[in-house]
């Protein structure tokens, strides 16, 4: 950056190089150029010469004043007009930053995604700080009282192998940057209570032409958790409101759920699961679309699918999966 240049003088910022956004700041430039009594001192911000709020303090020093500085980053440098020099002479440069102290981290959440081998901890960092902000995640065993600390810039994945202090832990997060430090409340966790089952996937749909046509949704998961509670939500694509069905599920075979839907309408389905009685849900699965026929039966599928663990039977049809911005991970 600009800070790596060879200086013929000195540039400094008051109150500091990193300061609170919206502050008034002063940038000082002091020339120390051999055989040069500067006629004029110039300031540049991001390569553009500043024209206003420059005050000459003495023969070698000038000040640039900014009111309510709101830029997160700027590269400043100053130059001197020396007698007998055609070009301005570079004095020095400095990168400056403005931002905010961190908010108190809240909504600290730790989950173990089944088979991941990690405990993933996240939190709400609050408002954007604009400056480099680091987080220290503290994990303290309630059994051994041993504490481990993990430094990160956002969330953290902690290998479950490193959690050797039993099953119960306290977790809290410290946020720190050049402008301040804050600490979250402590979260108490039990490792057995924070497991999120392997993702549930809707594989295909078919509408059976009967007296009252019914749509069967086939869905599955890799989970080996025995007691799993799931929700399937569905709506016509033209609707805003979701309908939700709840299921107690054992994924030893592909699940089949029946719906009585309106004919000739495009529906969208999503599923999510949690270990029964536990706190955290999976994110909603990818959107799965199925258009009900007017009268003729129809099958919709993402792929060919084994109907049980060992059967080898497959059902062929059309792919319809889509990713969506509505796939928010509301695990709370």
């Amino acid at each position: 950056g600009i800070t790596n240049i060879n200086c013929s003088g000195h540039i400094w910022v008051e109150p500091a190089t990193i300061f609170k956004m919206g502050m008034n700041i002063s940038i000082y430039c002091q020339a120390a150029i051999k055989n040069c009594q500067p006629r004029k001192l110039h300031f540049y911000k991001n390569g553009i010469k500043e024209r206003f709020q420059i005050t000459r303090i003495n023969k070698t020093t000038a000040r640039l004043w900014y009111k309510n500085f709101l830029e997160p980053h700027a590269s400043m440098y100053c130059t001197a007009e020396c007698p007998k020099h055609f070009q301005e002479t570079l004095i020095c440069g400095k990168d400056i930053s403005s931002g905010y102290p961190p908010d108190i981290p809240d909504e600290v959440t730790c989950v173990i995604y089944e088979y991941s081998g990690n405990m993933t901890c996240t939190w709400n960092a609050g408002k954007l700080t604009y400056i480099d902000t680091k987080y220290v995640v503290h994990v303290k065993s309630l059994e051994t009282e041993e504490e481990q600390q993990y430094l990160t810039s956002s969330y953290i994945n902690i290998s479950t192998d490193s959690l050797q202090g039993g099953k119960k832990y306290l977790v809290w997060v410290q946020a720190a940057n050049a402008l301040g430090m804050e600490e979250s409340k402590q979260l108490q966790i039990h490792l057995d209570d924070i497991v999120i089952p392997s993702a549930a996937v809707i594989s295909r749909a078919e509408t059976i032409n009967a007296t009252v046509p019914k749509t069967i949704i086939y869905w599955d998961s890799q989970t080996t958790i025995e007691k799993v509670s799931c929700e399937m939500r569905y709506k016509a694509t033209t609707n805003q409101t979701w309908n939700v069905k709840e299921f107690d599920t054992n994924f030893t075979y592909v699940q089949q759920s029946e719906f009585y839907l309106e004919p000739n309408i495009k529906y969208v389905f999503q599923v999510r699961c949690q270990e029964t009685g536990k706190r955290y849900w999976q994110p909603w699965s990818s959107l799965f679309f199925h258009k009900t026929p007017e009268t003729v039966p129809q099958v919709t599928s993402k792929a060919f699918q084994h109907d049980t663990w060992n059967s080898g039977l497959t059902v062929a049809s059309i792919s319809t999966g889509h990713l969506t911005s509505d796939n928010r991970g509301d695990i709370g």
Partner: nanobody
Framework: EVQLVESGGGLVQAGGSLRLSCAAS????????MYWFRQAPGNQREWVAR???????SYADSVKDRFTISRDNAKNTVYLQMNSLKPGDTAVYYC???????????????RGQGTQVTVS
């Protein structure tokens, strides 16, 4: 259609080694995670190991430091190197995969038929 075919099972003495392979074929755009599970008669299905597309791995405690999962993305194949085998490892070993069959991100779960591993 996507098929997963396991091979490499057999009878081995306690303390011995086996290497299982599982090859996926068919309409495959991309395979994300690949897994090994096992099931002994009268027991629940048990997860053994998982490997991500980027080769991140995780293992069940019961096999950690004895089994190694690996994969060859170009061949759509996953392997399970099993060392220091114990009678308690006797089971049918299944591989499974989270497969994208198209470019739109839709994932589907596929499972193999399994291969018998017997440790005497």
């Amino acid at each position: 259609e996507v098929q997963l075919v396991e091979s490499g099972g057999g009878l081995v003495q306690a303390g011995g080694s086996l290497r299982l392979s599982c090859a996926a074929s068919g309409t495959i755009f991309r395979i994300e995670n690949m897994y090994w599970f096992r099931q002994a008669p009268g027991n629940q299905r048990e997860w053994v190991a998982r490997i991500s597309r980027e080769s991140g791995t995780s293992y069940a405690d019961s096999v950690k430091d004895r089994f190694t999962i690996s994969r060859d993305n170009a061949k759509n194949t996953v392997y399970l190197q099993m060392n220091s085998l114990k009678p308690g490892d006797t089971a049918v070993y299944y591989c499974t995969a989270d497969v994208q069959t198209n470019s739109r991100g839709a994932q589907q779960i596929f499972r193999g038929q399994g291969t018998q591993v017997t440790v005497s």
